[in-house]
Amino acid sequence: TSSASSSSSSAPFLASAASAQPPLPDQCPALCECSEAARTVKCVNRNLTEVPTDLPLYVRNLFLTGNQLAVLPAGAFARRPPLAELAALNLSGSRLDEVRGGAFEHLPSLRQLDLSHNPLAYLSPFAFSGSNASISAPSPLVELILNHIVPPDDKRQNRSFEGMVAAALVAGRALQGLHLLELASNHFLYLPRDVLAQLPSLRYLDLSNNSLVSLTYVSFRNLTHLESLHLEDNALKVLHNGTLAELQGLPHVRVFLDNNPWVCDCHMADMVTWLKQTGVVQGKDRLTCAFPEKMRNRVLLELNSADLDCDPILPPSLQTS
């Protein structure tokens, strides 16, 4: 049943009449709850298998969470007249495994998109750009939330998941205006090197709870607006001089590095020196060594160069099996 809390005076929704006449612009779809005063439509936990066709034109905030959408085809939200006011679209936890090219076309005001908690076996390179042109029309997106979109191992395509996501982020340079990008909990082993260069407006980047081992090939240099960089709960062992210098050069950034398995050997010396003088790292007094065993739980800020040694590498003839 439709729960319409809209103050509009339109006739109640009748499923049998839906195909007989075009939908009224302010009615509420079946299985949804609508508030025209809040410009919000919620179709939540209803096991919907497709996007309702009869969304009211006033909608600015659309929740389609907890459904069973499976596939988001091209033009999934294209309507005539278009949903010109739709600004925030939440599709999290709706069992999406495929988002096709142009899925979000004809949404001229779409500024926030949340696809979190969907096992995306296929994310089209043109999901956000809408076209395969080398430079496409700028997307209006300002915030893109893609937490925990990694599919189970048996549903993965042959190509790397990191590469698939990166291709969608850089296609057509459409996301040049993106301010916020969340990519937490995606089992990322690496960050493709060209991604951040195509996202120069980023203010907030969340890469927490991944499996990033190194940032050696990642450049933050052009992210001059970056305010928050979340790298907690990864597999980082050390940050090298190039990365440290780039982070220090960003004028507004705060970096979060908790819960990484820092290796406190001779390669850590530069990072410890940097940590002691930088204001960039939030909660830097909480960072502790994980390896080697003798250094476990030592606080990085309390280390000095004498603590950070590397075991000499034995020549092959002296190594034992």
């Epitope: 006011e85 300002v142 915030e143």
Partner: antibody, heavy 122, light 107 residues
Framework: QVQLQQWGAGLLKPSETLSLTCAVY????????WTWIRQPPGKGLEWIGE???????NYNPSLKSRVTISVDTSKNQFSLKLSSVTAADTAVYYC????????????????WGQGTTVTVSS | EIVLTQSPATLSLSPGERATLSCRAS??????LAWYQQKPGQAPRLLIY???NRATGIPARFSGSGSGTDFTLTISSLEPEDFAVYYC?????????FGGGTKVEIK
């Protein structure tokens, strides 16, 4: 950070038209619902009406026949006119803005003007 | 229009005590309910939006709960600056409406 500054005549005679303007500084019009609210002396808050960036208006039915809210996007201002005032319209009038889109950074942001005391007396 | 009824009208408590304020709607407002704090001579300040979300900069001692018709604002441990009037407001239907307010005063 968005800030609001409001101004207008504070003393009116019965049957005159109340006119207040609110200027928006430090942010964009888009995404906000620009609102007027009033508070009679010693009483609670009453919603007068609102306008959004597309100039769509909604008014309190109890005041609708007398109220006009308009916006001038070129000046980043919005205005309230209330005609045929009586002593019952004596109140502190507030302009306010509510960010009603689900942005991480801004959703739930709520800004208010300093309030203008309007007295209607013959 | 949707009528919001707040109770009690006045709550007399001491600093450090827990305050529980109620707001009841005449019909469902889903989760589209906000709580405001107002001190004498000042504009109201948003505390809670969408029934349970704390606004930016609001201390964790303020929490909101409820949906449909019954809502609660809880102040876990009153600080001296918390003594004020609190209003609920619904944004489910036009006209937007406020409750009559609850005054939290020092016992």
């Amino acid at each position: 950070q968005v800030q609001l500054q409001q101004w207008g005549a504070g003393l009116l005679k019965p049957s005159e038209t109340l006119s207040l303007t609110c200027a928006v500084y430090g942010g964009s019009f888009s995404g906000y619902y620009w609102t007027w609210i009033r508070q009679p002396p010693g009483k609670g808050l009453e919603w007068i009406g609102e306008i959004d960036h597309s100039e769509s208006t909604n008014y309190n039915p109890s005041l609708k026949s007398r109220v006009t809210i308009s916006v001038d996007t070129s000046k980043n201002q919005f205005s309230l006119k209330l005609s045929s005032v009586t002593a019952a319209d004596t109140a502190v009038y507030y302009c306010a803005g509510w960010f009603g889109e689900l942005y991480h950074y801004y959703y739930g942001m709520d800004v208010w003007g300093q309030g203008t005391t309007v007295t209607v007396s013959s | 229009e949707i009528v919001l009824t707040q109770s009690p009208a006045t709550l007399s408590l001491s600093p450090g005590e827990r305050a529980t304020l109620s707001c009841r709607a005449s019909q469902s407002v889903s989760s589209y309910l906000a709580w405001y704090q107002q001190k004498p001579g000042q504009a109201p300040r948003l505390l809670i939006y969408d029934a349970s979300n704390r606004a930016t900069g609001i201390p964790a001692r303020f929490s909101g709960s409820g949906s449909g018709t019954d809502f609660t604002l809880t102040i876990s441990s009153l600080e001296p600056e918390d003594f004020a009037v609190y209003y609920c407001q619904q944004r489910s239907n036009w006209p937007l409406t406020f409750g009559g307010g609850t005054k939290v005063e020092i016992k």
